[in-house]
Interface confidence: low
């Protein structure tokens, strides 16, 4: 089901708007994939759940409210304040954990962006031309990454020399979309939490 369009207040924490757009875009893309790939295992029950960010980022730990994380780390996150250059924070002074949380989200988005772009390049070679990634979803990922980061980093596309297996690619697309939707929900909750704090 499509999520309702939220119209943010002009003064709202800027990344909340982007995260709402992201959640809506990935939900729409997942719905489209389920419908288009109806004869593929693409439902939440059928797929193997895989987290491409595992061991690379710590978004869930870093983004828990500070009250929950204060005893989690051997380093005291409350004693030291930090400033990042990410535009989502505007000129806010923020705790290290908040900066780390936003950085972890950025890293997640970057990893998914690489995977999605690589996958889209393969899907474009499919003679059936059955499904492609929604350009709006890719654009929304890009927008949120830019909002999180003043100094834009170029995201490399992974090159693949072997002949793509389109069946496997479509199954992987479903796996990635399911995982990314869960991450998008987390990101949206974090941004809502930061907007409220």
């Amino acid at each position: 089901r499509n999520l309702p369009v939220a119209t943010p207040d002009p003064g709202m924490f800027p990344c909340l708007h982007h995260s709402q757009n992201l959640l809506r875009a990935v939900s729409n893309m997942l719905q489209k994939a389920r419908q288009t790939l109806e004869f593929y295992p693409c439902t939440s029950e059928e797929i193997d759940h895989e987290d491409i960010t595992k061991d690379k980022t710590s978004t869930v730990e870093a983004c828990l409210p500070l009250e929950l994380t204060k005893n989690e780390s051997c380093l005291n996150s409350r004693e030291t304040s930090f400033i990042t250059n990410g535009s989502c924070l505007a000129s806010r002074k923020t705790s290290f954990m908040m900066a780390l949380c936003l950085s972890s989200i950025y890293e997640d988005l970057k990893m998914y962006q690489v995977e999605f772009k690589t996958m889209n390049a393969k899907l474009l070679m499919d003679p059936k031309r059955q499904i492609f990634l929604d350009q709006n979803m890719l654009a929304v990922i890009d927008e949120l990454m830019q909002a999180l980061n003043f100094n834009s980093e170029t995201v490399p596309q992974k090159s693949s020399l072997e002949e793509p297996d389109f069946y496997k690619t479509k199954i992987k697309l479903c796996i990635l979309l399911h995982a990314f939707r869960i991450r998008a929900v987390t990101i949206d909750r974090v941004m809502s939490y930061l907007n409220a704090s």
């Epitope: 710590s58 051997c74 900066a99 936003l102 950085s103 972890s104 980061n149 100094n151 980093e153 995201v155």
Partner: nanobody
Framework: EVQLVESGGGLVQPGGSLRLSCAAS????????MSWVRQAPGKGLEWVSF????????SYADSVEGRFTISRDNAKNTLYLHMNSLKPEDTAVYYC???????????RGQGTQVTVSS
């Protein structure tokens, strides 16, 4: 096997500068955020700074903000910490860490000693 080797520490007078380096190997350096943490004599670990995998996002402790600059060269698999206007309270062993800088999750090097004294 993950290896992080820090260098560049030493004895410096207050107001002086140092550049710490951390040579990384055994993992895809460009895929990970990196951090510097430090441990002053008789104190616990303190986060100093972190930098995102591509170098675009960085963050600093209040105590070093405006004096220290973190950077990285992904082509050389090296992390840096440029330290200016050093103070006696910056005296510590500085460790380079892979990831968020929390020892539950991350590897860290053997450290390099920085002593600020006249």
């Amino acid at each position: 096997e993950v290896q992080l080797v820090e260098s560049g520490g030493g004895l410096v007078q207050p107001g002086g500068s140092l550049r710490l380096s951390c040579a990384a190997s055994g993992f895809t350096f460009s895929s990970y955020m990196m951090s510097w943490v430090r441990q002053a004599p008789g104190k616990g670990l303190e986060w100093v700074s972190f930098i995102s995998s591509g170098g675009g996002i960085s963050s600093y402790a209040d105590s070093v903000e405006g004096r220290f600059t973190i950077s990285r060269d992904n082509a050389k698999n090296t992390l840096y910490l440029h330290m200016n206007s050093l103070k006696p309270e910056d005296t510590a062993v500085y460790y380079c860490t892979k990831g968020r800088g929390d020892t539950r999750y991350d590897y860290r090097g053997q450290g390099t000693q920085v002593t600020v004294s006249s």
